[in-house]
Structure formats: structure tokens, C-alpha cells
Interface confidence: low
């Protein structure tokens, strides 16, 4: 999906008002574990591409993020503020339902959510050149 035509300010507002808190809640209890930010992005559409990938694509060691509160709110924000986004996700959602697993918070998931925090921060940062 091409995120170029999203309403970035509305997504920024959604992130600030709810998604950021849900990410913090998910990470709470990690004893100041420091994960290095290895995933980055260079502009707002690129950031959303990386955010979508990390949030909704299962990875080795972490298959359970899509049902987390921050993920559901991310999906809602993208569906509302990115024209045509929801249509592209119908097939992906159906596939995800088939492989839905028990919710388990693994260290790998915590690392992935830490990367997500970094990506959202870069999306939200005022220094970012808007493409």
C-alpha cells in the first residue's frame, strides 16, 4: 500500500492521543531493558510502511501483536485516514484470522514493540521532511 496520500496530521493526532499510551502500557514491566533501534524510516509514508509491517506481519518469535490494543487502534487510524487502505487489508485480515494464536508476550515481541515506538517517534518528529 502507498501511504503517500494519508492524512498524516490526523494519524499523528491518533498516535498522540491513544496509540502512544497503548505502546507504553505494552512495554510496562520491562525492567529498563534497552533495545537498540535497528529499524528506521526516512519520511512519513516510509514510516507508516515500516509501522504496518512490524505491527501486522508475524515475525519469528512474535506472532501475536495484531490483536494488541495499539495494533487495533493503528489499524483503525490507517483505515480512516489513508484512502483505500482498508480494501487492501481485507485479504491480509482473513489470512491473519486463520493463524491467530494464543496471546503471549515474548521478549522478541517486546523488542519489536520497542522498534515500533522508535518508528512512531520518527513519524511524529517535527524534523522529518514531509514527502
Amino acid at each position: 500500500y502507498d501511504f503517500t496520500n494519508c492524512d498524516f496530521e490526523k494519524i499523528k493526532a491518533a498516535y498522540l492521543s491513544t496509540i502512544s499510551k497503548d505502546l507504553i502500557t505494552y512495554m510496562s514491566g520491562t525492567k529498563s531493558t534497552e533495545f537498540n533501534n535497528t529499524v528506521s524510516c526516512s519520511n512519513r509514508p516510509h514510516c507508516l510502511t515500516e509501522i504496518q509491517s512490524l505491527t501486522f506481519n508475524p515475525t519469528a518469535g512474535c506472532a501475536s501483536l495484531a490483536k494488541e490494543m495499539f495494533a487495533m487502534k493503528t489499524k483503525a487510524a490507517l483505515a480512516i485516514w489513508c484512502p483505500g487502505y482498508s480494501e487492501t487489508q481485507i485479504n491480509a485480515t482473513q489470512a491473519m484470522k486463520k493463524r491467530r494464536k494464543r496471546k503471549v508476550t515474548t521478549n522478541k515481541c517486546l523488542e519489536q514493540v520497542s522498534q515500533l515506538q522508535g518508528l512512531w517517534r520518527r513519524f511524529n518528529r517535527p524534523l522529518l521532511k514531509q514527502q
Epitope: 493526532a13 498522540l16 492521543s17 502512544s20 529498563s32 534497552e34 533495545f35 537498540n36 533501534n37 528506521s40 520497542s114 515506538q117 522508535g118 517517534r121 511524529n124 518528529r125 517535527p126 524534523l127
Partner: antibody
Framework: QVQLQQSGPQLVRPGASVKISCKAS????????MHWVKQRPGQGLEWIGL????????GLNQNFKDKATLTVDISSRTAYMQISSPTSEDSAVYFC??????????WGQGTTLTVSS | DIQMTQSPASLSASVGETVTITCRAS??????LAWYQQKQGKSPQLLVY???TLAEGVPSRFSGSGSGTQFSLKINSLQPEDFGSYYC?????????FGGGTKLELK
């Protein structure tokens, strides 16, 4: 716990550049922006600029573009602000503060800079 | 640049009173506003962010409200430790700017 420890008070001559430090501990240094804020005696707060420790990219208030230089040293988890050609107008307390979303949840204790001949 | 106009500049009140400080932005900043308290010789402390969310550890007698261009900070039943200076700050776009401050003094 999160701490931002700033360098001590400095007395400098006009024109002699000065560097203030802010050492972070208790959190992931590269996840948060580091900001610098100026407060002149008896005055309000003025945003100087910010730096992203993850890549060293900085953004400055236009009022400070020829005055302040922001840098970080990830290995020592320290942010720096250099003030060039200081004058009496630069005499102030300078704070570092961390931010994830634009508001400052932790502040350094402040560094008093006095510019006097 | 977005200008933040805070009022009143100073305010005298007694312990137990309720006070309200207001902040006006020169353009729409949605809910991108924070409030800080600063005691003499100390660093500012975050009270409220996102216009109305109370920061961790802040007593419930503090409350923030507003969105768009008009915001306010209300302190119910003032306590002796509440006296000091208060600042609003927007973080919608750079440069982030602060209000001029409100000095809350004991009557």
C-alpha cells in the same frame, strides 16, 4: 530511575564559547529526543532546539541558529550544547529535557551560565 | 511561529481556594499542549500533557481542559506546595513555544 545530570555553573568571558553537558541514565537514550530550554533570570522559558540521539539530527529554533550547536555522544549517553560567542544576553539557566511526543517528562537540574568580563 | 498567550501573569490566592489559569494559542494546536509547574530555583515539572492528561504522580486537584486554541489549568483546593510559576507549552509544530507564565502567590 530516569535522571538527567547537567554540568555545573559556568562563568565565561564574552566571546569565549562554552559547552554544557547533560548525562542521561535510567532509560533508552536513543528512544527519546533531547531538548534544550533557556530561562533568563526572572523570565519565562524559551525552546532552543532538540537533537535525536539515534542519528544526531538536530533542529534549532531560528532564534538560536547562529548561537547554539547540539551534539550527542551515545557511548557516554551525554547530550551537549555549545554556545558560541556568548554575550550578556546569553546569561541564563539552561535546561535539558527529554521528550518522546513533544512534552517534557524529565528535566535536568539546570546549568547556570554567567557571561561577564 | 505559534504564540502562546497565558493569563493572568500573576495571581494571589489562599490555601483552599480554586484557581484557573488560561492559555490561548494563536492558531489551532488541537490537544498538543502541556502544563508545567516551576518552583523558585528548580526545574519545571510536568503536570498535564495532551491538554488534559494528568502526568504520573500529579495530584487529582489539578486538571487540564480545552482544545484547538483555548486551554485552561484548574487547581482545586490550593495546597501550600502549589504556589510557584505555571507555564503552558504547545508541541504542535516547531518552534515549540511556551506561554509567558503565571506566578501564583500566597495571598
Amino acid at each position: 530511575q530516569v535522571q538527567l545530570q547537567q554540568s555545573g555553573p559556568q562563568l565565561v568571558r564574552p566571546g569565549a564559547s562554552v559547552k554544557i553537558s547533560c548525562k542521561a541514565s535510567g532509560y533508552s537514550f536513543t528512544t527519546y529526543w533531547m531538548h534544550w530550554v533557556k530561562q533568563r533570570p526572572g523570565q519565562g522559558l524559551e525552546w532552543i532546539g532538540l537533537i535525536d540521539p539515534s542519528d544526531g539530527e538536530a533542529g534549532l529554533n531560528q532564534n538560536f541558529k547562529d548561537k547554539a550547536t547540539l551534539t550527542v555522544d551515545i557511548s557516554s549517553r551525554t547530550a551537549y550544547m555549545q554556545i558560541s560567542s556568548p554575550t550578556s544576553e546569553d546569561s541564563a539557566v539552561y535546561f535539558c529535557a527529554r521528550s518522546l511526543d513533544g512534552y517534557y517528562d524529565y528535566w535536568g537540574q539546570g546549568t547556570t551560565l554567567t557571561v561577564s568580563s | 511561529d505559534i504564540q502562546m498567550t497565558q493569563s493572568p501573569a500573576s495571581l494571589s490566592a489562599s490555601v483552599g481556594e480554586t484557581v484557573t489559569i488560561t492559555c490561548r494559542a494563536s492558531e489551532d494546536i488541537y490537544s498538543y499542549l502541556a502544563w508545567y509547574q516551576q518552583k523558585q530555583g528548580k526545574s519545571p515539572q510536568l503536570l498535564v500533557y495532551n491538554a488534559k492528561t494528568l502526568a504520573e504522580g500529579v495530584p487529582s486537584r489539578f486538571s487540564g481542559s480545552g482544545s484547538g486554541t483555548q486551554f485552561s489549568l484548574k487547581i482545586n483546593s490550593l495546597q501550600p506546595e502549589d504556589f510557584g510559576s505555571y507555564y503552558c507549552q504547545h508541541f504542535w509544530s516547531t518552534p515549540w513555544t511556551f506561554g509567558g507564565g503565571t506566578k501564583l502567590e500566597l495571598k
